[in-house]
């Protein structure tokens, strides 16, 4: 006998899709050997219609696929525009058609629906609405009319004009007369039921004159829509449920091992905690119709998801309802990159974000998410030149390394930078990933000046003092714009005195303005990094002021941070304190600013919590 | 959370026929499979039947030790699925359970036990030769 299986039996109807699951030993043989889907014909043969080898015959052309699933030991067979042509035998098998590693399905698509007998059909999706018209004749216009649903043997009432409602339909069933021109009554049930699927019978009058129209209500589960993703890449689900709920609350909920749909995220505000930084539920439109996205996709975020709209936001009876199967690639074409990044307070962070390289020329762009509401995620920089206001001087994108990766750096850091940020590209989608910044406890590596003061047409030295452990690292001094970080060139002091039990491999290296103008003004930064991998930076804002007396100026580190036998050169200067220090013209007071760059489609934003890796902010 | 009891087992001779029936109440449109297992004396429990429903289509298994003999099906408006049993054998003698869940296709193998989350209480079969 085969160790083959699968369904004995499909039964479909015209116009559907079926998805057929073929199960097979997973030995490494079989995981790897030919799978395929034949008819059988009369004389015994069997035709192949598409296998895994990539043939697909004209008559499943466009219409179907084959899915192999060698982890599970199943392939599945997804056809879709079934027709009654396709009735009859099939086998689903491995290697050769005619070796025997196969199972017999019988296929049958019945006729859809149509009139028959006088019977209207109504086909209709659990928890949608359905209106059953119910034509009558003039003499019977003032007279009862009704709506039965045939139990067993026996009409039940279900409603009348005269007020009556079944209570099993209570609260979701109403008759509507239309005006006295149209010869008509309408009944609309809502949040329809699968119990609510059967033969109703709607009637105007009571006597042996009576109009009665027979309709058939046939309540379809949705069937599942198979969505295949990579790991820590991301998904959207797109639900469309209809006008009618457009003002009832909606969900997404994950079929979980109890009987329960366990909520995910709805528009009430609740959302699971495996989904914190990594999730959007998209505003929805007018009609209705919303979408989630779920970015750093897991192995465990695999299973069975639906939307649905219900006032209580999670899924009750009658909740009108769309479903995927969600299967995540574990042979991802994403890389794994660190989902958490370290740095402390007054330091900084480099970011890597991966991004399809096939797609180089895309805009990257890196945003904040929020999790207030359903979440959204405002854009705080793109590589086209635009930072968001409050990050001027401390947030840039490089589009180094190149090649599948993006830098974001960010500096002079304070708690409220901690939080889920996304690294997203304005081409695939898929391609979107998370990184948590966390603020630790410690000091910055780099030491630098507060801000700055330069005189116009003098000379300006600012240092930045490298402790040992960057001693390998390249060591650079940069004027910060809206586009990058525009290399500066800067001079190697020798050994600094600014640190502690650090031997003469610290470095104190000096950017030197000579003859400032007023278009040195700005942010600088000093950095180091390997290659094109950035380590850690360090701000200074540098003001241009009007000639008071003649000289060059010298800036030092503040008296806190000198060592011991270092002459402090310039005591103007406030301290270094163990914060970030910001350009004094943006600190005045954090103000909401309504950005118009802010994602109000948080559709195109998007993360990866996929790997549970770890980066420093000092190293990478 | 949804309850099911099964009913129509019974003593019944070698060649004859019985139909059991796996009634489901509760949060019954949230299940998408049904499956039929059995259970002989001294014997592990073992796959006999599945249904799963999908949008307008139906899929039905069979285990190769009742092809032929034995079908399944449901009345949806009833929340009752169906074991029609013929040409019974006395190694068909055994406890048989309906098992619901509410994951359809794709979902776990239809015959593995771990892919149902709801059980009834059992009901026997006999077979005398």
């Known amino acids: 006998k085969s160790p083959i299986f699968g369904p004995e039996e499909v039964n479909s109807v015209e116009g559907n899709s079926v998805s057929i699951t073929c199960y097979y030993p997973p030995t490494s043989v079989n995981r790897h050997t030919r799978k395929y889907w034949c008819r059988q014909g009369a004389r015994g043969g069997c035709i192949t219609l598409i296998s895994s080898e990539g043939y697909v015959s004209s008559k499943y052309a466009g219409r179907a696929n084959l899915t192999n699933f060698p982890e599970n030991g199943t392939f599945v067979v997804n056809i879709a525009q079934l027709s009654q042509d396709d009735s009859g035998r099939y086998k689903c098998g491995l290697g050769i058609n005619s070796r025997g590693l196969s199972f017999d399905v019988s296929l049958e698509v019945s006729q859809g629906p149509g009139l028959l007998n006088d019977t209207k059909v109504y086909t209709v999706d659990l928890g949608r609405t359905v209106t059953i018209n119910c034509p009558f004749k003039t003499e019977n216009a003032q007279k009862r009319k009704s709506l039965y649903k045939q139990i067993g043997l026996y009409p039940v009432l279900v409603i009348d004009s005269s007020g009556y409602v079944n209570p099993n339909y209570t609260g979701r069933i109403r008759l509507d007369i239309q005006g006295t021109g149209q010869l008509l009554f309408s009944v609309v049930i809502n949040q329809l039921r699968l119990s609510d699927a059967g033969q109703y019978l709607c009637q105007a009058g009571d006597d042996s004159n009576s109009n009665k129209k027979n309709a058939d209500l046939q309540v379809l589960k949705p069937e599942p829509e198979l969505v295949y993703e990579d790991l820590r890449g991301s998904v959207t689900f797109h639900c469309a449920l209809g006008p009618e709920v457009a003002n009832v609350a909606k969900f997404l909920c994950r079929q979980s091992s109890g009987e329960n749909c366990d909520v995910v995220v709805n528009t009430l505000g609740k959302r699971a905690p495996a989904f914190e930084g990594r999730i959007l539920l998209n505003p929805q439109d007018k009609d209705g119709s919303f979408s989630v996205v779920i970015t750093g996709l897991r192995k465990e975020d695999a299973g069975r998801y639906l939307c649905g709209a219900h006032s209580d936001g999670q899924l009750q009876e009658g909740s009108p309802i769309q479903a995927w199967q969600l299967f995540v690639n574990e042979e991802s074409t994403i890389p794994r990159s660190p989902t958490v990044v370290k740095g402390v307070a007054g330091g900084s962070v480099a970011v890597l974000c991966p991004y399809n390289r096939k797609e180089s020329k895309s805009i990257k762009y890196w945003c904040l998410w929020e999790g207030a509401q359903n979440g959204r995620c405002p854009l705080l920089v793109d590589s086209e030149g635009w930072v968001k206001a409050q990050y001027e001087g401390r947030l840039s994108l490089l589009e180094e390394p190149g090649n599948g990766t993006f830098t974001v750096i960010l500096n002079q850091l304070t708690s409220r930078d901690a939080g889920f940020y996304w690294c997203l590209t304005n081409g695939d989608t898929l391609w979107r990933t998370t990184v948590e910044i966390k603020i630790i406890e410690g000091e910055p590596n780099l030491k630098v000046p507060g801000n700055v003061t330069a005189v116009l047409g003098e000379t300006l030295k600012v240092p930045c003092h490298f402790p040992c452990k960057f001693s390998s690292y390249e060591k650079y001094w940069c004027k910060w714009n809206n586009t990058g970080c525009q290399a500066l060139p800067s001079q190697d002091e020798g050994p600094s005195k600014a640190f502690v039990n650090c031997d003469e491999n610290s470095r104190l290296v000096s950017l030197t303005l000579n003859l400032v103008t007023r278009a040195d003004e700005g942010w600088y930064w000093c950095g180091v990094k390997q290659g094109h991998f950035y380590g850690e930076t360090a701000a200074v804002y540098v003001a241009v002021e009007e000639r008071k007396a003649a000289g060059s100026r010298d800036v030092s580190l503040a008296k806190a941070d000198a060592a011991p036998d270092e002459k402090v050169l310039d005591s103007g200067f406030r301290e270094i304190e163990n914060k970030a220090i910001q350009d004094p013209r943006l600190f005045a007071e954090e103000k909401a600013v309504a950005d118009t760059r802010d994602q109000a489609d948080g559709s195109r934003a998007s993360v990866d919590s996929g790997s549970s890796e770890e980066q420093g902010g000092s190293s990478r | 959370q949804v309850q099911l009891v099964e009913s129509g087992g019974g003593l019944v001779q070698t060649g004859g026929s019985l139909r059991l029936s796996c009634a489901a109440s509760?949060?019954?449109?949230?299940?998408?499979?049904v499956g039929w297992f059995r259970q002989a004396p001294g014997k592990e429990r073992e796959f006999v039947a599945a249904v799963i429903w999908s949008g307008a289509s139906t899929y039905k298994y069979a285990a190769d030790s009742v092809k032929g003999r034995f079908t399944i099906s449901r009345d949806n408006a009833e929340n009752t699925v169906y074991l029609q049993m013929n040409s019974l054998k006395p190694e068909d003698t055994a406890v048989y359970y309906c098992?619901?869940?509410?994951?359809?296709?794709?979902?776990?193998?239809?015959?593995?036990?771990?892919?149902?989350?709801?059980w009834g209480q059992g009901t026997l079969v006999t077979v005398s030769s």
């Open positions: 509760g949060r019954t449109f949230s299940v998408y499979r």
């Open positions: 098992a619901a869940d509410p994951l359809g296709l794709p979902g776990p193998d239809v015959r593995v036990e771990g892919g149902y989350r709801h």
